[in-house]
Amino acid sequence: LPKAPVITTPLETVDALVEEVATFMCAVESYPQPEISWTRNKILIKLFDTRYSIRENGQLLTILSVEDSDDGIYCCTANNGVGGAVESCGALQVKMKPKITRPPINVKIIEGLKAVLPCTTMGNPKPSVSWIKGDSPLRENSRTAVLESGSLRIHNVQKEDAGQYRCVAKNSLGTAYSKVVKLEVEVFARILRAPESHNVTFGSFVTLHCTATGIPVPTITWIENGNAVSSGSIQESVKDRVIDSRLQLFITKPGLYTCIATNKHGEKFSTAKAAATVSIAEWSKPQKDNKGYCAQYRGEVCNAVLAKDALVFLNTSYADPEEAQELLVHTAWNELKVVSPLCRPAAEALLCNHVFQECSPGVVPTPIPICREYCLAVKELFCAKEWLAMEEKTHRGLYRSEMHLLSVPECSKLPSMHWDPTACARLPHLDYNKENPKTFPPMTSSKPSVDIPNLPSSSSSSFSVSPTYSMT
């Protein structure tokens, strides 16, 4: 008897790896024998398509070598003219080991810009993409993110982002690694220390100092009144991507001197300029309004007292600030050889920090005076007798030089760290040392007082005290 078709084994989802064989079975019972047709995503699969094999009177569909594009819904339809046609559908899920289709490439980028290292992948399940920098997994942060596509985006690229990168694509079937690529960060030329203007006596030697950095390391050229420098000697040194150029001049006329730092980025150049004037005038005494600049202390006398690599204020009202200030401490230092062992380290700390004042940034880099509390500690605790003697000699006019006035600050005119802890500089040598406390006679005062805070010492001195002082 004629019998309408019935699909006895409905199609199921088939998982297959790329390049493997995938088979759908559509077992049909009917009489007469049905015609069975197959579709993929509702498009008829032609019998003569060599990518497929249709056997068992159409009941078996085999994909001979699965491609990732074979993903989809496969349906078999059976019809024998008796009753209606019947249909069963199943999905083919193409499984694929990770494959990097667009690997990262070497990138040169300018600091501050955005860098994108591509890493486009294929795979099923969809691979997760991570990145390795050097030998370690790259941690995402506020500037670094792995995009949905797998690409690595770095915002506001910094020098420390430079290095070797590779991407890793991973799913349950395997892992794929890209080749190692290099991210090179280039930095525009930038002047770190501009030459300072000088007001000097006729016939003086002046050294103009210009420090620049950049990647690649810039070159420095000097211009005098718009033309290449014709006289003077130039000394250059390069260390840690910083170029340091010193132009030594014998001054017989005023001039405008420009330091030009240049480096190349592909076909383009970046340039930074800084200018200083050299004028001729009579030698003038230090002025009240902090004319000068901040630079690393390079002297010898205060090496043990000032913090390592300390930025100190150099007063340009001197023809050669470094030399003049070093001479100042040197002269006073020799006189400290006669003071008591209690006083001497404290006085040396006060002297060095008074002449070579610590630099503070902010609106403009400026010198910070010593905190009143530390000045008073030296004056009233460590060096009470010596201070009185020095003040007496000063009042009686026994000191011919003004240098001693500079080496004895007026404590009452110094700011207190109680009111603004950032307004003044501490003398770490005088800080209370918990490990090695020394007892000193306490200071008596009816006014409110505060301890000198515990701060790390900038040298090996174990000199320590915790006095209390008036704050007003």
């Epitope: 009240k288 309004d289 902090n290 901040c294 913090a307 690599d309 300390a310 930025l311 610590e358 630099c359 503070s360 940034p361 902010g362 609106v363 403009v364 880099p365 400026t366 910070i368 005119k413 110094l414 700011p415 207190s416 009111w419 603004d420 802890p421 950032t422 307004a423 704050m471 007003t472």
Partner: antibody
């Protein structure tokens, strides 16, 4: 105890002027940097100006050329002259003691610029 | 100018809970071996108050549950309240004093859960 008391705020029309004062007490005024900082209603803090111990002044770009900071060390008073005021200058104006940290703040004086 | 970015913009905390506020600077604020980064607290209806200066030094009178971190040439700074108290409900601002203009972060509002 440090005290900073601002005054001089009020309602002013756009294009108008005001002079703010801040009387300081409890510390040696002349030895310290002084600042003005403002806070618009419901907004964050904006630094405006600082004057150092030599009366050298520095300003934020938003107020440069319109506002002038000054100090009188005898009267222990800090001033801020506000000219050519704009509606966006409406804020609470604080007088603040401090060099690189803003250590002590006054209670503020309200400036409202509206037509 | 230096731009400071704070995260999160707001946070709710229970009493005794640890609260962490981050501040990212668009450039290093390290000068002369100190990071010129400060933290302030502004309670509702009050003037701001300095909590931390030089990134990690606590201002006198500030409870020791407040601490600041960030050292070397880092651009990431953190204010931590180790055990949140009701009086800590406030807006917290970071501020740099490395160069002009002095700039503040947008603030982080800390509320009681």
């Amino acid at each position: 105890e440090v005290q900073l008391v601002e005054s001089g705020g009020g309602l002013v029309q756009p294009g108008g002027s005001l002079s703010l004062s801040c009387v300081a007490s409890g510390f040696t005024f002349s030895l310290y940097y002084m600042n003005w900082v403002r806070q618009a209603p419901g907004k964050g803090l904006e630094w405006l100006s600082v004057i150092d111990t030599h009366s050298i002044a520095y300003y934020a770009d938003s107020v440069k050329g319109r506002f002038t900071i000054s100090r009188d060390n005898v009267k222990n008073t800090l001033y801020l002259q506000l000219n050519n005021l704009k509606p966006e200058d409406t804020a609470l104006y604080y007088c603040v003691l401090g060099r690189t940290a803003l250590v002590r703040w006054g209670q503020g004086t309200q400036v409202t610029v509206s037509s | 100018e230096i731009v400071l970015t704070q995260s999160p913009s707001s946070v709710t905390a229970s009493i005794g809970e640890k609260v962490t506020i981050n501040c990212e600077s668009s450039q290093s604020v390290l000068y002369n071996q100190k990071n010129y980064l400060n933290w302030y607290q502004q309670r509702p209806g009050q003037s701001p108050r300095l909590l931390i200066y030089w990134a990690s030094t606590r201002q006198s009178g500030v409870p020791d549950r407040f601490s600041g971190s960030g050292s070397g040439s880092t651009t990431d700074f953190t204010l931590t309240i180790s055990s949140f108290q009701p009086e800590d409900v406030a807006v917290y601002y970071c501020q740099q004093a490395y160069n002009a203009p002095l700039t503040f972060g947008p603030g982080t509002k800390v509320e009681l859960k």
